[in-house]
């Protein structure tokens, strides 16, 4: 999977929707220059490809939605990497340009003769990609050509700015909301001193910026803030972990506004350095309840509290997906590669046979084994439906009383489609209302997850709360079996009576040493001792001064 030859999944139709999914992991640091992608992904890749193909089948067989119009698609692999996604987006654009030139009769062969060649249909809109950084790059290109983009998991706050990203919309909320949710969790458990880590790139950077701003307003201190690339090498992760340990035992909580693979890198480093149980990770929705993040490193992840976008499993997707087999699934060009990777065997005799596996896949293999649906499946499907409803509303207004594509709709005008999409309002796959605000954002509801040891060597994510519209609800008993088990993450303990906080130069406001006031001083505020005026003395609680009662000495009084 390198830059020379990219695989594409096609489904024919009257209108073609583009999609960018991370079918493969991003290139490792040493392979970035050749844009050589990593291993195939199931949840973020294959499942999303299949969701697109099957959702379009459902839309096309729904007589009430886009009657007499067939939706098709062109699915490309973003590899969760900007350079790859841009390269793929250029292919989408190229299709559009060739098609529009053809409409104007501009297609000419090299020798100057006219061409009877029918090019591919233009892409009217794009679903995805998943990553915010990648989505920004793709949007910068797509908006030049008025191609609307609907994201299913790009949550960066920057994308709300319509002056910069006019053709961008999303069926997920902005990260400002989950940053607030994370701060609310930190506040709830009185963690006033935490370390912070974020993934290099827009998602992590803007999310962590919001977390830090909100934390400061709430009196929460950040011991230190670190950033790291998701595809950083072992050494980089080890170095980061060593830095985090330098803030122990005070900053035990690590707030991680991270992509899932960054969290995995941290867990792996914890294993290498023997640091399991030293930290409590508070993770953003990049981690959520993903098993591909914790697999093999459950001990290191135990106790982790994560934010997950609320999205129930989609039953009809599983009914379709779990029946798929490599010998019959020919429309997904990555499926055979995935099957071999998933079951660690080779599809002997097939063109995509992977000889790195010795064992031949047998016919009893099934996707039902250890199946986990992509946690963002509902959003992926809602994004596809949004595009369909937007096109449907556009058809209704441009082609009244006409079933199918009328001339007024040909070729599809991206500006009009965007207008129509922004007004879209329908019931989503989980029964929730899908609509877009003036920034193209959707409202947000989160679930709070806790990664726990459920039994001997059995670990799982448990729903321990929710955050909805600014209100945090947590089942504290589920997270902490006893109050005394609540982890402490504070820099300094409160000062005793008659002591003030002395903050050393260059230290954050949550770290202090407690110093007692002098004998004649009282605690004026938490940082200042003040001497009592002549004739007065500190009160017993040392919070003020009382006048010293005047005592007159008489002859005969004993010496004091």
């Amino acid at each position: 999977q390198s830059s020379e030859r990219r695989v594409v999944a096609h489904m024919p139709g009257d209108i073609i929707i583009g999609a960018l999914f991370s079918v493969h992991h991003q290139p490792t640091v040493d392979k970035v220059h050749e844009r050589k992608c990593g291993a195939v992904r199931e949840q973020y890749g294959i499942q999303r490809v299949e969701a697109m193909l099957h959702t379009l089948e459902r839309i096309n067989s729904d007589p009430t939605l886009l009657p007499n119009i067939t939706l098709g698609c062109e699915i490309r692999d973003s590899c969760w990497h900007s350079a790859v996604a841009l390269e793929q987006s250029i292919e989408f654009i190229r299709d559009s340009l060739i098609s529009s030139e053809e409409e104007e009769g501009l297609v000419r062969c090299v020798d100057g003769s006219s061409s009877s060649f029918r090019s591919k249909k233009p892409i009217v809109g794009v679903i995805g990609p998943g990553s915010s950084s990648v989505a920004i790059q793709v949007q910068n290109l797509l908006q030049l050509f008025n191609i609307p983009q609907i994201a299913y998991s790009a949550t960066s706050m920057d994308l709300s700015d319509k002056t910069l990203f006019k053709y961008f919309m999303r069926v997920v909320p902005s990260d400002a909301q989950q940053a607030r949710a994370m701060v609310d969790i930190v506040k709830r458990y009185n963690w006033t001193y935490v370390s912070a880590v974020h993934t290099e790139g827009n998602y992590g950077e803007s999310g962590m910026e919001a977390f830090k701003d909100m934390s400061a307003k709430e009196g929460i201190c950040i011991a230190h803030s670190y950033k790291i690339y998701s595809n950083a090498g072992e050494q980089s992760f080890d170095k980061l972990l060593k830095k985090l340990t330098s803030h122990l035992p005070k900053a035990r909580v690590v707030a991680c506004f991270c992509e899932g693979m960054t969290v995995r890198g941290l867990l792996m480093a914890m294993r290498r350095l023997g640091l399991a149980g030293e930290f409590l990770l508070l993770g953003s929705d990049g981690w959520a309840d993903r098993y591909d993040v914790t697999d093999g490193y459950q001990r290191e992840a135990v106790g982790g509290i994560t934010i997950k976008l609320q999205s129930p499993d989609v039953k009809w997707f599983d009914d379709y997906y779990l029946k798929l087999r490599p010998e019959t699934n020919h429309r997904n060009p990555w499926f055979q590669e995935f099957w071999q990777h998933r079951f660690q065997c080779r599809l002997e005799g097939f063109p995509q046979e992977n000889s790195k596996y010795n064992k031949t896949c047998n016919s009893s293999l099934t996707l039902k084994t250890h199946h986990v649906q992509d946690s963002k499946m509902g959003f992926v499907i809602n994004a596809i439906y949004s595009m369909a409803y937007g096109l449907h509303n556009m058809q209704m207004s441009l082609c009244p009383g006409y079933a199918g594509l009328c001339d007024a709709m040909k070729p599809i005008d991206g500006r009009k489609l965007l207008e129509s999409l922004m007004k879209t309002n329908f019931t989503g796959v989980s029964g929730d209302t899908i609509l877009f605000d003036e920034n193209g954002d959707s409202p947000g509801r989160y679930e709070i997850m806790n990664f726990k040891e459920m039994g001997k060597d059995y670990f799982d994510y448990i729903n321990v709360g929710s955050w909805d519209n600014g209100e945090l609800k947590m089942d504290d008993d589920e997270v902490w079996s006893k109050k005394s088990n609540i982890i402490r993450s504070v820099c300094s303990e409160p000062c005793e009576k008659g002591q003030i906080k002395v903050i050393r130069k260059g230290e954050v406001s949550c770290c202090w040493t407690c110093t007692p006031c002098k004998e004649n001083e009282y605690v004026f505020d938490e940082y200042t001792c003040k001497a009592c005026q002549l004739g007065s003395w500190p009160t017993d609680d040392l919070t003020g001064c009382d006048l010293i009662p005047v005592q007159y000495l008489r002859w005969g009084d004993p010496e004091p």
């Epitope: 010998e327 599809l347 005799g349 010795n358 064992k359 016919s363």
Partner: antibody, heavy 120, light 109 residues
Amino acid sequence: QRQLEESGGGLVKPGGALTLTCKASGIDFSSYYYICWVRQAPGKGLEWIACIYAGDGTTYYATWAEGRFTSSKTSSTTVTLQMTSLTAADTATYFCARGSGVGSYGYNLWGQGTLVTVSS
Amino acid sequence: DIVMTQTPASVEAAVGGTVTIKCQASEYIYSNLAWYQQKPGQPPKLLIYRASTLESGVPSRFKGSGSGTEFTLTISDLECADAATYYCQGYFPSIITNAFGGGTEVVVK
């Protein structure tokens, strides 16, 4: 000298059972090899029965052989084929052969075969 | 049902001549075809696998071609030692099974 040798053939009554053994010498059935069973009725052509992956003992059978024939790896140099409910149609020379897959690479090492006769 | 149809059943050619044997798969099998030579009282010997790859030690006079459902084995510069029965073996990846052709007897005059 790398070779495979089959044993266990002989005369068996209809409805009876028999276990054939394939023993390797000069090689062991290391994890990337497949040991397959092929039979040939007297004067007739070849017929594929089954394969076993030496790595973990996963088996692959011809549809007609499923249930009646069972292949297992009993050591690093031996594989067996258990045959039950035998009929006259099962009379044949049984070969074991080694390949790099169930079939797409062919079988590059064969035993001399062992004759099984099913008769009352 | 999966079947490998091999033709002809028997062919006769002179020393130095050329023989062509055809094999047809009942289903698309990509390049999953092997050719064997078997002499009386001996086990089969692998000549070609993956439709056209010559097994080591096999003379280049043996040539395999074809893909999908139609395959051919060509033996040129026939020698007396080439007199034998030749079998094709098709591997059907979609059902993970094998089938052999009925065999072709080559007689060298």
